[in-house]
């Protein structure tokens, strides 16, 4: 581990490098060669890793195919129409000692003698309860099987087995059918069988899957199902509140409050990448990008990234970048939320970037939340805060995020806290006092019931749990089309969202949030 990899001789020196030799079971005249590559070092672009592939011919001749572009996400396929002689193996040459090859396949030309004995695949249908002996359950080229021997209300399971010559495959996954009660593909949604949709086809990716499950970012209506992709259409629908940042803003679970940064300081900034852009809620339109090389195109309007240093420089200098997000109302943290616009991965690199996260309390003490892997697939990154119950609770006023790649772009940081509940204040209440969620403070205990004032919100519709405005009453406020919900507490704007609604609660004579609908 103490060896510097750049001062010892490489494992695969130029000009030839290392080679992997693979032999195939049957020599044949090839039509194509396919190679599956699963890893290429970061030092190589796609054209450098495989510097030659040689075909080993039965005649003793080695046929060089030259250098090849290889990628991890798509197999390399080389057409070999001109070879015209039997090949028994291949040699793959590389200068990359970390190159990983998963498989190689040599495909023969048409009508090769090896295939003359081959028979078409056959399929056998197996049923539980078993089919009658005289029922032809082996299908040849016709892949349709009709079962006529059924009883109403009975449960049947079917499997398909593939037959090649005398060999049989493992049975397929089973399909269960209750005769007379419908099935996935009949256009009727059988909720009792776990169906969420039924569009009468067996295609994945159209909103309703092969197994009649609704696919992510789709909504399906009617029978047979008609599915549409809703994410990003500008309409915040009930079912997408938790999933669509574009349409509904950032989802905050009930009982929690998300505060976005009200101020920020960063380690590296200039006029091209100012730190202040991470203040407030992130832009909904920003899609997280991975494997980038250049962040100059418009990212700095929505997100901060350390633009003052290049990626190669930061790696050689082992630079650490950081940002501090400050919050206007120190709270007991339940989670920290980090929104990414890029996840720090470099084009041609497999390495995922990590961030280190700390909470800073009102006494300037640091509380470590650990290292977290960044990925656009897991965006926003939600980091739960686990409190040591043997220690006093603390109010967090800032979050520090540090990382080592200048290709990390962050568009927002939020502090998630408990709505109407403050363990620090709660623990400070004296005898004769009780914690008031409305005041967020300790108040002298009083038994008289205090009603809330009438709730009046312009440009909104109200749906209240009762006509009384007693302690615990709840009203749901929904803004009319074209208006944006502004949610405040103690004159601090805590959230601005395009829809669809917010619930306010009457607590000891006060509504727990002030709500307005702004154009």
């Amino acid at each position: 581990s103490a060896v510097n990899p750049h001062t010892v001789p490489p494992a695969c020196p130029e000009p030839q490098g290392c080679y992997l030799e693979l032999e195939f079971l049957y020599p044949l005249v090839p039509e194509s060669l396919t190679i599956w590559v699963t890893f290429v070092s970061t030092d190589w672009d796609s054209s450098g890793a495989v510097n030659d592939i040689k075909l080993l011919a039965v005649s003793g001749k080695n046929i060089s195919l030259g250098p090849q572009n290889v990628f991890c996400d798509v197999p390399l396929t080389i057409r070999l129409w001109d070879v015209g002689e039997e090949v028994y193996g291949i040699q793959i040459y590389t200068l990359d000692e970390h190159l990983e090859i998963d498989a190689a396949m040599l495909t023969s030309t048409a009508d090769t003698p090896l295939c003359l004995q081959c028979k078409p695949l056959k399929y056998k249908v197996v049923r539980d309860p078993p089919l009658q002996m005289d029922v032809a359950s082996i299908l040849h080229l016709n892949r349709k099987f009709v079962d006529m021997d059924l009883n109403l209300g009975s449960v049947y399971q079917y499997w398909v087995i593939t037959i090649s010559g005398t060999e049989e495959s493992e049975p397929s996954p089973a399909v269960t059918y209750i005769h007379g009660s419908g099935y996935c593909g009949d256009g009727i949604i059988q909720k009792d069988q776990g169906e969420q949709c039924d569009d009468m086809n067996k295609i994945n990716g159209d909103g309703c899957s092969l197994f009649c499950r609704q696919e992510v970012s789709f909504n399906c209506i009617d029978e047979p199902s008609r599915c549409y992709f809703h994410d990003g259409d500008g309409v915040c629908e009930e079912f997408e509140q938790k999933t669509s940042i574009k349409d509904c803003g950032v989802y905050t679970p009930q009982g929690f409050l998300d505060q976005w940064a009200s101020n920020a300081s960063v380690s590296h900034q200039d006029q091209q990448c100012p730190g202040w852009v991470i203040i407030g809620q992130p832009a909904a339109s920003q899609v997280c990008r991975t494997k980038v090389i250049d962040l100059s195109e418009g990212i700095s309007q929505h997100a901060w990234y350390p633009c003052t240093i290049s990626y190669p420089y930061s790696q050689l200098a082992q630079t650490t970048f950081w940002l501090r997000a400050y919050f206007s109302q120190p709270m007991v943290a339940a989670a920290v939320i980090v929104h990414l616009v890029t996840d720090g991965t470099y084009y041609g690199d497999q390495k995922q970037e990590t961030i280190s996260v700390q909470l800073l309390d009102t006494k300037d003490q640091s509380h470590d939340l650990g290292l977290h892997v960044l990925s656009c697939r897991n965006n926003p990154l939600i980091i739960p805060v686990v409190h040591d119950l043997s220690q006093p609770f603390y109010h967090s006023q800032a979050v520090r995020v540090s990382f080592s790649s200048p290709l990390v772009a962050i568009s927002g940081v939020a502090l998630r806290s408990f709505d109407n509940f403050d363990p620090v204040t709660l623990s400070s209440c004296q005898r004769g006092e009780t914690y008031s969620p409305a005041e967020q403070s300790c108040v002298h205990f009083a038994c008289e019931k205090t009603d809330c004032p009438e709730l009046a919100v312009e440009n909104a519709s109200l749906n209240c749990s009762s006509s009384d405005r007693y302690h615990g009453a709840q009203c749901t406020v929904s803004c009319r089309t074209g208006y944006v919900l502004q949610i405040r507490r103690d004159d601090e704007l805590i959230k601005s969202q395009t829809g669809p609604s917010v619930t306010v609660t009457c607590t000891e004579g006060k509504w727990n949030k002030q709500v307005a609908c702004e154009p």
Partner: antibody
Framework: QVQLVQSGAEVKKPGASVKVSCKAS????????MHWVRQAPGQRLEWMGW????????KSSQKFQGRVTITRDTSASTAYMELSSLRSEDTAVYYC????????????????WGQGTTVTVSS | DIQMTQSPSSVSASVGDRVTITCRAS??????LAWYQQKPGKAPKLLIY???SLQSGVPSRFSGSGSGTDFTLTISSLQPEDFATYYC?????????FGGGTKVEIK
């Protein structure tokens, strides 16, 4: 003033190795990066690799990977570039050039260059 | 590798002329581009770094601009000592690569 002084011209046979030195003065050697660049006759400049003179970490161009070794002697404020398995096409002028500060960069690019070392590879 | 393409490969100009040299990268390189001047038999000299920052001691008639893939070096009023070859170089991705050079000659 800041300067880089390189070793003298070399004539080598194919297959041999050459080691070029670059002595730094006028600045804190270990606070900066050091690049190596070469230029064949009538050709464009070609980057070979660089080193963090403080940590000794290096990165070289894949074209030279395995043939080029960049090292340093901090006590002598000297950087070295060794190129092995020489071939005729390695005939060129080899330059060392100071890169940015590895602590608090205020500039980028290669701001100070050595005078160059001519290496001739011939049988 | 990122290819750096300079144009023109040579330009003939007179003292006092405004000269513009362009450099195009085959992929985006943000602002990580430097410009160098090289005279025959001499080592290159850094003129501009980070696309537009003037290196200390370099006359203000030299200026750089651009971001992403397209960059420009401008000499606002050519002086006799400016006749040389100019190279651009990217340092956004390994390996760092240079352009083919633009020779500025006396008309």
């Amino acid at each position: 003033q800041v300067q880089l002084v390189q070793s003298g011209a070399e004539v080598k046979k194919p297959g041999a190795s050459v080691k070029v030195s670059c002595k730094a003065s006028g600045y804190t050697f270990t606070s900066y990066a050091m690049h190596w660049v070469r230029q064949a006759p009538g050709q464009r400049l070609e980057w070979m690799g660089w080193m963090n003179a403080g940590t000794g970490a290096t990165k070289s161009s894949q074209k030279f990977q395995g043939r080029v070794t960049i090292t340093r002697d901090t006590s002598a404020s000297t950087a070295y570039m060794e190129l092995s398995s020489l071939r005729s096409e390695d005939t060129a002028v080899y330059y060392c050039a100071r890169g940015p500060s590895m602590e608090t960069p205020t500039t980028f690019g290669m701001d100070v260059w050595g005078q160059g070392t001519t290496v001739t590879v011939s049988s | 590798d990122i290819q750096m393409t300079q144009s023109p490969s040579s330009v003939s100009a007179s003292v006092g002329d405004r000269v513009t040299i362009t450099c195009r990268a085959s992929q985006g390189i943000s602002r990580w581009l430097a410009w160098y001047q090289q005279k025959p038999g001499k080592a290159p000299k850094l003129l501009i770094y980070a696309a537009s920052s003037l290196q200390s001691g370099v006359p203000s008639r030299f200026s750089g601009s651009g971001s992403g893939t397209d960059f420009t070096l401008t000499i606002s009023s050519l002086q006799p000592e400016d006749f040389a070859t100019y190279y651009c170089q990217q340092e956004n991705a390994y390996p760092f690569t240079f352009g083919g050079g633009t020779k500025v000659e006396i008309k």
